[in-house]
Interface confidence: medium
């Protein structure tokens, strides 16, 4: 049998195989050693007994999508039946005090491969034997601790395979420079040691994607915005846009990345090399946010130019090649422009990523301030309690709810939270009365909210003993305004 007979039904065309050559991978036209590595079709009854105590599940994941030219990493993790785990020596053991359907096991081992390899290797002096080989006959790599690696993973994609000896978890990275754009299938078959041969224990497949578009995500944050995920934001407050480029293999680390923003509000185009940008919408309405990310990435060199022709083809929008002529005179040294190039790459290519969102801008509460605090005299039956009136103003829309959170002086341990609806006039001036049980210093967080916004101010107050001569004091004053201004409070004691 050949690898493609064993590993998958999907046969890529000769063109695909020729143009998707993966470095270090082998053609699936190679022969498969079926004596050492038996092949079982799906539904074969032997799968039931391939593992003691149940079935092993293989989970295949990747960090797809991958920008063409970057590395994509595949990870396979084996999930053993309940109560089983791999120990430090690579043996499969029962977890202590773990009860499965068969009850507690007297034998600590599910598979004691250390004992097997000592008893049955029959090796020559080099530590090599005829059965310590992969399905294609290549010998196992003899790096330190290789005997503790008891699983054989065979990865298969694009008409090629890659063999790896490992433990219950392995990772394989593939460079995508030669991979055709679009979705591709990765299949993995896992074998375990079984005396002088191997037994299949799991098969898994997963789709991965190679793209010429930079994968781009944008997070949006705005102070006072009640729900950051609904793409509704507040007028007259800056929104922070943060661009996240999915580049797990750091392919673009050496690239100059440009971010071109159009906020859809006739403020024009804004270009930046910074992945974060702030923008303030000054009108209500719905706006189309557009971002184009452009990066210079290592890429294939274009073929030598043909003899000049009268008309010049227009480069495609998705990718524009740039070659680097090492004879070009430069400003310094032998070839100073090498400084800005990726090592060992002769050419670069423009790669683009796009993000679009529709943003709704509405009125919201922009700011809240405590402008006055008044100690309200309590009747005699409550000598330990203090009533305090907070006079609060706000800017922006009219709030419908007020909440006060009273906590310890560090503002970390909440003692009391009270929320109540409010009916405020156009001036946005309201009085909030709260009770403080006992003297001391308190942190007061006061929020005003409506459907779309939530504005906060905080202050430390010092509540004195119930001595008529001692006035209410601000212990310290602070709030969460961007300009870090301190609040000015006017204290009145009755």
């Amino acid at each position: 049998k050949r690898f493609h007979d064993v590993l998958g039904n999907e046969r890529p065309s000769a063109y695909m195989r020729e143009h998707n050559q993966l470095n270090g991978w082998s053609s699936d036209e190679n022969d498969w050693n079926e004596k050492l590595y038996p092949v079982w079709k799906r539904g074969d009854m032997r799968w039931k007994n391939s593992w003691k105590g149940g079935r092993v599940q293989a989970v295949l994941t990747s960090d797809s999508p991958a920008l063409v030219g970057s590395n994509i990493t595949f990870a396979v993790n084996l999930i053993f039946p309940r109560c089983q785990k791999e120990d430090a020596n690579g043996n499969i053991v029962y977890e202590k005090n773990c009860r499965n359907e068969a009850g507690l096991s007297a034998d600590p081992y599910v598979y004691n491969w250390t004992a097997w390899s000592e008893d049955s290797d029959g090796e020559n002096g080099t530590g090599q034997s005829h059965h310590n080989v992969f399905p294609d006959g290549k010998p196992f790599p003899h790096h330190p601790g290789w005997r503790r690696w008891n699983f054989i993973y065979v990865f298969h994609t694009l008409g090629q395979y890659f063999q790896k000896l490992g433990r219950c978890s392995v990772r394989v990275s593939v460079n995508t420079a030669n991979v055709t754009l679009g979705p591709q299938l990765m299949e993995v078959t896992v074998y375990r040691r079984h005396g002088r041969a191997y037994v299949p224990i799991a098969q898994v497949k997963d789709v991965y994607v190679v793209t010429d578009q930079i994968p781009v995500f944008v997070t949006m944050f705005q102070k006072n915005d009640r729900n950051s995920s609904d793409e509704t934001f507040l007028k007259d407050l800056p929104i922070m846009f943060d661009v996240l480029i999915h580049d797990p293999s750091h392919f673009l680390n050496y690239s100059t990345i440009n971010y071109k923003w159009s906020f859809g509000d006739n403020t024009g185009l804004f270009v930046s090399t910074n992945h974060t940008v702030n923008h303030t919408y000054v009108l209500n309405g719905t706006f189309s946010l557009n971002l184009t990310v452009k990066a210079a990435a290592p890429g294939p060199c274009p073929p030598p130019p043909p003899p000049p022709r009268p008309s010049k083809p227009t480069p495609s929008l998705a990718t524009t090649l740039k070659s680097y002529d090492s004879n070009t005179p430069g400003p310094a040294g032998d070839n100073p422009l090498e400084l800005s190039r990726i090592p060992d790459e002769n050419c670069q290519i423009n790669r683009y990523g796009h993000f679009q969102a529709t943003i709704t801008i509405v009125e919201g509460i922009l700011e809240v301030n405590i402008i006055q605090m008044t100690d309200v005299l309590m009747p005699v039956p409550w000598p330990e309690s203090s009533l305090i009136d907070f006079v609060v103003t706000c800017q922006g829309s009219i709030p419908t709810e007020v909440c006060t959170i009273i906590s310890d002086p560090t503002c970390e341990i909440t003692q009391n939270t009270v929320c109540s609806p409010v009916d405020v006039d156009e001036m946005c001036l309201l009085t909030v009365r709260r009770t403080f049980n006992g003297s001391g210093t308190y942190c007061v967080n006061l929020t005003l909210g409506d459907d779309t916004s939530l504005a906060l101010t905080s202050t430390l107050i010092s509540v004195p003993d119930r001595d008529p001569a001692s006035p209410l004091r601000m212990a310290n004053e602070f709030d969460y305004k961007d300009d870090d201004d301190k609040l000015e409070h006017h204290h009145h004691h009755h």
Epitope: T256, K260, T273, L317, Y324, T328, L337, S340, N350
Partner: antibody, heavy 122, light 106 residues
Framework: QVQLVQSGAEVKKPGASVKVSCKAS????????MGWVKQRPGQGLEWIGA????????NYNQNFAGRVTMTVDTSISTAYMELSRLRSDDSAVYFC???????????????WGQGTLVTVSS | EIVLTQSPSSLSASVGDRVTITCSAS?????MHWYQQKSGTAPKLLIY???NLASGVPSRFSGSGSGTDFTFTISSLQPEDAATYYC?????????FGGGTKLEIK
């Protein structure tokens, strides 16, 4: 060797437009961004913007946004900078400069044109 | 935008002197470039990427620094060094230049 040759001096009236050209030779035109810099008489240097000739991706200084347009004609390796709605304070020498390979911030303007004097006067 | 503050704005020195010009950035940057401009001509790149000497530039010119503080030095002043010197950053848009330092020979 690398050369940037700019168009000749211009005299314009306020409100008019001016288009300055910069012809590049001696290197692959699409490999480097082309920047434009303004210098008023006796003053310092002010960056107007830059264009990547490979795809006409532009980046303008906000101080000039809305009035400046940068373009290229790759078939003749020439960059253009057009400034509209001219004012008296636009009277200056305008330089084109070959900027870092592939827009890299690691390299400054390694080659400069000789400058084009634009005079705005009624 | 990143503001580059050059000092001094002008200085006078004798042939053979060691001359130092500083450039302070309002935010941290990775690379600083230095130019020389003589009257009626285009600026000429002397130093790129903070400390690299541009092609054909004499070794008496050097640059150093990191973060927000950068220095340009002429180790032994020559008569032909009379010019205005500018620092320049292209780490953040818009690119900006320092205000310039006019260097005269005594």
């Amino acid at each position: 060797q690398v050369q940037l040759v700019q168009s000749g001096a211009e005299v314009k009236k306020p409100g008019a437009s001016v288009k300055v050209s910069c012809k590049a030779s001696g290197y692959t035109f699409t490999d480097n961004w082309m920047g434009w810099v303004k210098q008023r008489p006796g003053q310092g240097l002010e960056w107007i913007g830059a264009i990547d000739p490979s795809d006409s991706f532009t980046n303008y200084n906000q101080n000039f946004a809305g009035r400046v347009t940068m373009t290229v004609d790759t078939s003749i390796s020439t960059a253009y900078m057009e400034l509209s709605r001219l004012r008296s304070d636009d009277s200056a020498v305008y330089f084109c400069t070959r900027s870092g390979y592939y827009g890299s911030p690691k390299l400054g303007g390694d080659y400069w044109g000789q400058g084009t004097l634009v005079t705005v006067s009624s | 935008e990143i503001v580059l503050t050059q000092s001094p704005s002008s200085l006078s020195a004798s042939v053979g002197d060691r001359v130092t010009i500083t450039c302070s950035a309002s935010s941290s940057i990775s690379y600083m470039h230095w130019y020389q401009q003589k009257s009626g001509t285009a600026p000429k790149l002397l130093i790129y990427s903070t400390s690299n000497l541009a092609s054909g530039v004499p070794s008496r010119f050097s640059g150093s620094g990191s973060g927000t503080d950068f220095t340009f030095t002429i180790s032994s002043l020559q008569p032909e060094d009379a010019a205005t010197y500018y620092c320049h950053q292209w780490n953040s848009y818009p690119c900006t230049f320092g205000g310039g330092t006019k260097l005269e020979i005594k």
